[in-house]
Each structure stands twice: as structure tokens, then as C-alpha cells.
Interface confidence: medium
Amino acid sequence: LPAQVAFTPYAPEPGSTCRLREYYDQTAQMCCSKCSPGQHAKVFCTKTSDTVCDSCEDSTYTQLWNWVPECLSCGSRCSSDQVETQACTREQNRICTCRPGWYCALSKQEGCRLCAPLRKCRPGFGVARPGTETSDVVCKPCAPGTFSNTTSSTDICRPHQICNVVAIPGNASMDAVCTSTSPTRSMAPGAVHLPQPVSTRSQHTQPTPEPSTAPSTSFLLPMGPSPPAEGSTGD
């Protein structure tokens, strides 16, 4: 004979759990139906009647099969430094993520609670580690033979040009100036060599993360504005 299918509510066998999409109600001491995502329990089950479910109201949701008496409130609207990547519906909460040029300084279950602008490395400093969705840019001083003359959250230190005759030697924040008409590029130690026209001055290629002997300039202060780190600017 086939096993008899129990209809909710029913008393579970000792030591057994309720079936999928059911829960054990402590008060009724019965296995009862859960409400589907987008719904909540309007009336809890009893020994003789099953859970009565109702749809979530506007701006509320349930993402899981549940038996909560009220749906959860969707989060507040996304702030100006955020993008809404998932709208509030009856089955899912609103998700806000940081817009380009910003990173998440304080995350929550899904999305971001607090965004902060990516650090910009000032001239003489280049990007040692690029920013990600959840971490800030790390700046490092440009090593000898390399420079950065920009204030940027993406530019790395680039090698000085090699001159036949040097008019002005390069430093950490300025390229060498040549009197010769045919400068070449050096392969300075620690520099990323990227073939490009000499006139190009802005390099947006993401660098390969490397250990730096310079002190880390990345620190996180989600509670209020932070002073600019060494080699960075808040602009």
C-alpha cells in the first residue's frame, strides 16, 4: 500500500522533521505550510486549520519561504553616490551599489551601506593597488626612474624617457625633458613598460599588484571623513 500523504496541518512523527516548505509551529505543535516569497502569514495555523498567507504590501518584501506576521521593509532609496542595481519588489529588497569612482566602505547583507570616493594618488605617487568594489586605491611613491604627474585613482608610475641629451632630469612627479629629437623609453626597475606614443601622458592600464616597501597608504575610516593619506588627495 502506498504511504498516506499527510495534509497540513499534521503532527510529525517523533524525531522527524516537517517536509519542504513546511515548518513546525511551536504553538499548534503541528507541521504547517510556509508562505511563499512575496507573502507573509496573515493567520497562523492551528491544530485544525493551515497557515493563511497574504501578499506583501508596497515597499515590503519576503525573499524566503516564511511564516512571518509582517513582510520586511525595503531599504531606503539609494543615495546620490549609489546606483540601484535591484529594485524593491514583493520578493526582493532594493540593492544599492556604489557608482563608478567610488567603493563600498561599509557593506550590508546585499549591496552597500556607505560608499566612499576612490583615493586619488597625487603627483609623485602612482597606484600600487587599484580600487575594487570593496577596497580603496593604494598609492605608492614612484621609484627612481619612474614618475607620475597626475592626480588620479588609476594612473601608475611610468618610466622616464631616456634622452640623448637631458635638458631637465626627471623626478618622481615629472618626466625627463630632452633636447634631443629622438627620446627613447627606459626599462627602469619596478616600472611597468607599456609601449605607447611619447606624447601620451595618461596611463589607465591596471597595474599588477606588487609588494611595496613604502608604508601602506590605504586605511579605512567609515565613521566620518578621513584626512588624505600620504600621496593621495581628497579632491
Epitope: 515548518y23 511551536q26 519576503t62 524566503l64 512571518v68 520586511l72 547583507q109
Partner: nanobody, 124 residues
């Protein structure tokens, strides 16, 4: 679906201590409350304590307040029940169980997943 595995039970003398662990796994775990209930022969199933995995809010049955402490380690997806000043009436099989979005308004109303349980015996 969630999986819950309890450990840490044993035999202890009255006045002694034990710490139970509940290792949880599954999707959306942060949306759940994890609670403990106990079963003893001839007694009704009794809710002991629960904790919200996201907010960390906790609740306790009157019978264990001041003696039991529930805590969570979200990195390990584990909930702990530290039981001090144990009494013979604390004897039973302790199960950890889950409830979506629960625990803010008292002990778990119900459970949708629960583990096999771990035996706690308080006896001299």
C-alpha cells in the same frame, strides 16, 4: 535549504558547564534566526534561546535566563550555547533549529530545519 549539525553534549554534574555548537550551512543563512530547543522524556518540546544571524539580537526562555548565553560566529557560520550552572531539569536532547527572519520578538515561533540533536545529561 539549510543543514544544521549540533555537537558538544555530554554528561555533567549539577552546577557544571557545557558549550553546545550548531554548525549551519545553506543559502541565505544571514536572513535566519538560529535557535535551540530541547526535548526530554515526558516533557513538551521547549524553546531555550535564539539569535538573529544578521543583527545578533538574542532571546532566552525564563528557565535559562542568566545561566545560558547564545552567541554566533558568522565567519564560521556557527552558533554556540554556553550553559552554566546546569541543573538536572536541563537534561534532554538539545536541537538547533532555524526560522527565517525570526528571533526579534521572542523565542522562535517554529522551526523549518532542525538537526539530529545532542544529548545533555545533568546528573551526579
Amino acid at each position: 535549504e539549510l543543514q544544521l549539525v549540533e555537537s558538544g553534549g555530554g554528561l555533567v554534574q549539577p552546577g557544571g558547564s557545557l558549550t553546545l555548537s550548531c554548525a549551519a550551512s545553506g543559502r541565505f543563512l544571514e536572513y535566519y534566526a538560529i535557535g535551540w530547543f530541547r526535548e526530554a522524556p515526558g516533557k513538551e518540546r521547549e524553546g531555550v534561546s535564539c539569535i538573529s544571524m544578521s543583527a545578533g539580537s538574542t532571546n532566552y526562555a525564563d528557565s535559562v535566563k542568566g545561566r545560558f548565553t547564545i552567541s554566533r560566529d558568522n565567519a564560521k557560520n556557527t552558533v554556540y550555547l554556553q550553559m552554566n550552572s546546569l541543573k538536572p531539569e536541563d537534561t534532554g536532547v538539545y536541537h538547533c533549529a532555524s526560522e527565517p527572519y525570526g528571533c526579534d520578538d521572542g523565542l522562535l515561533r517554529g522551526y523549518d530545519y532542525w538537526g539530529q540533536g545532542t544529548q545533555v545529561t545533568v546528573s551526579s
